[in-house]
């Protein structure tokens, strides 16, 4: 043997954020000299599950029928060929929605906005909770973090934009967490078209879809700029 | 010290369900696999299936898929074996057997305690 | 499913003799095969993971080789608390699988 085995690939269909309820494939694609797939969960000290590989041996499939919370969490996989262990994959961050009850999203002072004005999202929770999540649909990079600096739970994250331009017109939500496990999120807040006018094209709404859509590359990564809000909350980007 | 003790010998009719269960003690009961095996009189060891208490996944023999059901109560750290539509054929000593990782270097897994046996008699 | 085919089902050998089990299975399975002891009214007991591997606390006397689809397991002196049947087991896929076992008796 040259040197350690490669590593497999680790996914999950239709995506790694999924909702309570929902059904969830995890895959795991190694070589076709593969005679067992295994798939480990963080802090579980078992494999947490093993599978054989599907012909022509290159990946194995993880079915979970209904995604609850004790799914969420971190895997890793690996597969054994006849000179060993591979190495283990890159992590997958399995995420489920629909942990608490949905936060509010509204703008502030509008969703109308126009080029070069300054917009905050603002993402309200019924309960008080230490993290919360935007979301912009088909950004490459769709998650912002406002986080809790010592533990202190808030109602709210400001998520302030300046200057604004055509890039940030979309539709966005947003999910509140605890940070116990940011593996559980809220059930997603209804959407919010944000209208950028005074861009060269005009704005055309987004269909509504659900956070595990792949993202598109027209999107460049949302980076709101201006001063952190004065909420006890830290920025974040993923 | 490892423990698995098993439910007592069953006498059952064609047709009817056994349910097994095994009480594990002396480890983590969610760190290890559990096994069933069987083993007809006079006979060798069939592998029934194998549950994770940690989180209740499963794997079965083919033969045994649609009629035997693994579960576990990590209360009592207790797994159980249900098989169903029993016939003679089915008349064997049931075990449990723990399975884990015994070498330090990774993949090195075996069956390393077994319950006494459970004995199952199907007979009308 | 992978056979596994132990040779021979029996064998009646003196105490001190070499005693030698062979295993052969269908596929190459990559050196992930086990040996169980098991005496007559008992479980079976862990004597040999891995081929070669000893479980803890199992004498020495017990050993075992081999490759890809045969294996061997040897016990270099025999003694009267050995006597039982021993299986070979293969651990490489799903489902695991036994061979019909070999019944060691003292002459």
């Known amino acids: 043997q040259a040197g350690p085995l490669p590593k497999p690939t680790l996914w999950a269909e239709p995506g790694s954020v999924i909702s309570w309820g929902n059904s969830v494939t995890i895959w795991c694609q190694g070589t076709l000299e593969a005679r067992e797939y295994r798939l480990d969960k963080e802090e579980s000290p078992a494999p947490w599950d093993r599978q054989n590989p599907l012909e022509p041996k290159n990946k194995a499939r993880f079915s979970i029928p209904s995604m609850t919370e004790d799914y969420a969490g971190r895997y890793r996989c690996y597969y054994r060929s006849p000179v060993g262990w591979s190495q283990p994959s890159d992590p997958l961050e399995l995420v489920m929605t629909g942990a608490y009850s949905k936060p509010t999203l509204s703008a502030l002072p509008s969703p109308l906005v126009t080029s070069g004005k300054s917009v905050t999202l603002l993402c309200q929770s019924r309960s008080p909770m230490d993290t919360f999540l935007l979301i912009k649909e088909r950004a490459a990079h769709p998650l912002l973090h406002l986080r809790s600096e010592h533990g202190a739970q808030q109602h709210q994250a400001e998520f302030p934009m300046s200057p604004v331009t055509s890039v940030h017109g979309g539709t966005y939500r947003c999910f509140s967490s605890h940070g116990f496990s940011h593996y559980l999120l809220s059930h997603p807040s209804d959407p919010l078209e944000l209208i950028v006018s005074g861009s060269l094209e005009d704005p055309r709404p987004s269909p509504t879809r659900s956070v595990s859509t792949a993202a598109g590359p027209e999107d460049q990564p949302l980076m709101p700029t201006g001063s952190v809000p004065h909420s006890g909350l830290r920025r974040h980007w993923e | 010290q490892v423990q698995l003790v098993q439910s007592g010998a069953e006498v059952k009719k064609p047709g009817a369900s056994v349910k097994v269960s095994c009480k594990a003690s002396?480890?983590?009961?969610?760190?290890?696999?559990m096994h069933w095996v069987r083993q007809a009189p006079g006979q060798g060891l069939e592998w029934i299936g194998e549950?994770?208490?940690?989180?209740?996944?499963?794997n079965y023999n083919e033969k045994f898929k649609t009629r035997a059901t693994l579960t576990v109560d990590t209360s009592t750290s207790t797994a159980y074996m249900e098989l169903s539509s029993l016939r003679s054929e089915d008349t064997a000593v049931y075990y449990c057997?723990?399975?884990?990782?015994?070498?330090?270097?990774?993949?090195?897994?075996?069956?390393?305690?077994w319950g006494q046996g459970t004995l199952v008699t199907v007979s009308s | 499913d992978i056979q596994m085919t132990q040779s021979p089902s029996s064998l009646s050998a003196s105490v001190g003799d070499r005693v030698t089990i062979t295993c052969r299975a269908s596929q190459d399975i990559s050196n992930y095969l086990n040996w169980y002891q098991q005496k007559p009214g008992k479980a079976p007991k862990l004597l040999i993971y891995?081929?070669?591997r000893l479980h803890s606390g199992v004498p020495s006397r017990f050993s075992g080789s081999g490759s890809g689809t045969d294996y061997t397991f040897t016990i270099s002196s025999l003694q009267p608390e050995d006597i039982a049947t021993y299986y070979c087991?293969?651990?490489?896929?799903?489902?695991?699988?036994f061979g019909g076992g070999t019944k060691v008796e003292i002459k």
């Open positions: 891995y081929t070669s």
């Open positions: 002396g480890y983590t009961f969610t760190n290890y696999w």
């Open positions: 549950i994770n208490p940690s989180n209740g996944r499963t």
């Open positions: 057997a723990r399975w884990g990782q015994l070498g330090l270097r990774e993949g090195y897994y075996a069956v390393d305690y």
């Open positions: 087991q293969q651990g490489n896929t799903l489902p695991p699988t």
